[in-house]
Interface confidence: low
């Protein structure tokens, strides 16, 4: 239904607190360099304006679209061109082009320092003094670093953050209480960020149809007792919601997400038997709970998939009559039977099925032609299963850090032209798949591994797109989203790469490494490892092991020395010489 004032409508639906949070996220995602104080001033102005529209929908400018109102606010910022360069050119455009222009200037890798968590006491003091401002800073800092973060989900994480601080800041040992809890929230939020970026990439590159297919597969796995029409309705709504958030329509997105949660809770009987516990929660938690819901039990009496999609003599007729619906039902039927497959795999199978029907239905004897299609799925299913098996075995043998290093070597060999920081980030994230997925029961491993890897590789593609340096990476990133992971897995050592010359300064370290937190120490070592591989792309595993072992001993020895600086200065050149020799 149409509303006289869109902004008043959203303010009433969302309530002041969520409204303000979402406006702050929107501004922080568009203008990633602005300080919190500047954004919060704009948020207050927009909120005050929304309140006047609630009081009188006919008031001046209340009929303007939210994009127009937000864009006008952003374009009125003084010194916009000084701080943002060509983004200021967007302000010369009219809506909807202006918003599109803002979206194109979102930076996936903004030049911002890593978000440093303050020391526990300081954190609790500032939280207790002004919880609203503290959580506002959290929203701002996360949103500007992750310009595609799913806004309603970020509000949920801010709520979690609030809960943790409320609980831990009353404890005597605040740090012991805060650290593990905030680490857990951070880990979940970072995974959520790469997953959502993948959804927006899917929407931007391949459109709504591709995203909807993803949603149909996912919903069918979760809700195998729901009818196809129900799954279609849910997938349509989820597609709309994600399109809105990816497009910067955060108020509408959050409002529609709450509506969908309400619909699901009112229609549990036709969706899933597992929803009740979620439906008793408040709105943000309810939506989050529904998004993470466990799979319902598969109906016991499901007939073989072959009956309708292979053995039926009218397969080609049914396909010709309504291609999208027929393929949609195939994806639904296959997915509801296979919660143990990744969505990427299910979409590859649906694509294979479609290609088979396209070919066979044009031939003289279609049933004979498509009769073997299910058997032809086998290699497509085996490939990711083998990937999971070999990688989980390697993870169990090496542990997370060792596994990350193995992945780093592999990916540096595949794409040595990619910048070392990007390779290290990607390998560290890819390496976490072990901890995240390999400990799960067998039936959950494949979907966990492949869908997580796909999201991480999407981040690699997004960063590479900004400064393309590797033809192989460009090739894998340009293809279909569901083929990306197999494409990267199939890459081998890049034979065209001219090895980097050995630079002693790349392998020169100082005593400052000793005081770094463990994570930063690991990154330093992994940076050196990537540089070694770039210098010697065909180095053997043993050679790299020797050099890295030597390096670890050197750092350990010098960090324990009385005169650390002297140790690094004298032992460093020896290490460099030994490394060159070992790799000769």
């Amino acid at each position: 239904e149409a509303h006289k004032s869109e902004i008043a409508h959203r303010f009433k639906d969302l309530g002041e607190q969520h409204f303000k949070g979402l406006v702050l996220i929107a501004f922080s995602q568009y203008l990633q360099k602005c300080p919190y104080e500047e954004h919060i001033k704009l948020v207050q102005e927009v909120t005050d304006f929304a309140k006047t529209c609630v009081a009188d929908e006919n008031a001046e400018n209340c009929d303007k679209s939210i994009h127009t109102l937000f864009g006008d606010k952003l374009c009125a910022i003084p010194k916009l061109r000084d701080n943002y360069g060509e983004l200021a050119d967007c302000c010369a455009k009219q809506e909807p082009e202006r918003n599109e222009c803002f979206l194109q200037h979102k930076d996936d890798n903004p030049n911002l320092p890593p978000f440093q968590r303050p020391e526990a006491e300081a954190m609790c003091t500032s939280f207790q003094e002004n919880p609203t401002s503290f959580l506002g800073h959290y929203l701002h800092e996360v949103a500007r670093r992750h310009p595609y973060f799913y806004a309603p989900e970020l509000l949920y994480y801010a709520e979690k953050y609030n809960e943790v601080l409320t609980q831990c800041c009353t404890e005597s040992d605040k740090a012991a209480c805060l650290t593990p809890k905030l680490d857990a929230v951070k880990e979940k939020a970072l995974v959520a960020a790469v997953r959502q970026r993948m959804k927006c990439s899917s929407m931007q590159r391949f459109g709504e149809r591709a995203f909807k297919a993803w949603a149909v597969a996912r919903m069918s796995q979760r809700f195998p007792n729901a009818e196809f029409a129900e799954i279609t309705k849910l997938a349509t709504d989820v597609t709309k919601i994600n399109k809105e958030c990816c497009h910067g329509d955060l108020l509408e997105c959050a409002d529609d997400r709450a509506e969908l949660a309400k619909y699901m809770c009112e229609n549990q009987a036709t969706i899933s038997s597992k929803l009740q516990a979620c439906c008793d929660k408040p709105v943000l938690q309810k939506s989050q709970c529904l998004a993470e819901i466990e799979h319902d039990n598969i109906p016991a009496d499901l007939p073989s998939i072959a009956a309708d999609f292979v053995e039926d003599k009218e397969v080609c007729k049914n396909y010709a009559e309504a291609k999208d619906v027929f393929l949609g039902t195939f994806l639904y039927e296959y997915s509801r039977r296979h919660p143990d497959y990744s969505v990427s795999l299910l979409l590859r199978l649906a694509k294979k099925y479609e290609a088979t029907l396209e070919k066979c239905c044009a031939e003289g004897d279609p049933p004979a032609c498509y009769g073997t299609v299910l058997a032809e799925f086998q290699p497509l299913v085996e490939e990711p299963k083998n990937l999971v098996k070999t990688n989980c075995e390697l993870y169990e043998k090496l542990g997370e850090y060792g596994f990350q290093n193995a992945v780093l070597v592999r990916y540096t060999q595949k794409a040595p032209q990619v910048s070392t920081p990007t390779l290290v980030e990607a390998a560290r994230n890819l390496g976490r798949v072990g901890t995240k997925c390999c400990t799960l029961p067998e039936a959950q491993r494949l979907p966990c591994v492949e869908d997580y890897l796909s999201a991480i590789l999407n981040r690699l593609c997004v960063l590479h797109e900004k400064t393309p340096v590797s033809e192989k990476v460009t090739k894998c990133c340009s293809g279909s989203l569901v083929e990306r992971r197999p494409c990267f897995s199939a890459l081998t050592v890049d034979e065209t790469y001219v090895p980097k010359e050995f630079k002693a300064e790349t392998f020169t370290f100082h005593s400052d490494i000793c005081t770094l937190p463990d994570k930063e120490k690991q990154i330093k070592k992994q940076t050196a490892l990537a540089e070694l591989v770039k210098h010697k792309p065909k180095a053997t595993e043993d050679q790299l092991k020797t050099v890295m072992g030597d390096f670890a001993q050197f750092v350990d020895k010098c960090c324990k020395a009385a005169d650390k600086d002297n140790c690094f200065a004298t032992e460093g050149p020896n290490l460099v010489a030994r490394s060159k020799e070992a790799l000769a």
């Epitope: 009818e227 196809f228 029409a229 129900e230 279609t232 309705k233 349509t236 709504d237 619909y263 229609n267 309708d308 999609f309 009218e314 049914n318 396909y319 009559e321 309504a322 619906v325 027929f326 949609g328 039902t329 195939f330 639904y332 039927e333």
Partner: nanobody, 119 residues
Framework: EVQLLESGGGLVQPGGSLRLSCAAS????????MLWVRQAPGKGLEWVSV????????YYADSVKGRFTISRDNSKNTLYLQMNSLRAEDTAVYYC????????????WGQGTLVTVSS
Amino acid sequence: EVQLLESGGGLVQPGGSLRLSCAASGFTFDTSSMLWVRQAPGKGLEWVSVIHQSGTPTYYADSVKGRFTISRDNSKNTLYLQMNSLRAEDTAVYYCAKFPSTHGKFDYWGQGTLVTVSS
């Protein structure tokens, strides 16, 4: 026995509008998703639009998006298709069908209503 009866077809000029209706009986209409499909002269069946049992439209074929609107009145057991900005290529027999629960076969059809768009 399931019965679907379409009406509202006829001759209309390009750019004109028509509203098709489909009266349903013999099954629980308010728990069934419904759809419109059409068959142009000498062509195969083309699916037009699906509406979910709750009344939220789910799908429109690209060829009709923005011009056609599917709706339903569960209290009257009736399905509608509002067709605006009609074009010559919309000329076809329009059928309403009960959406199947699992696969792509449409079990129950009406007898169809002819829409002709011509100047």
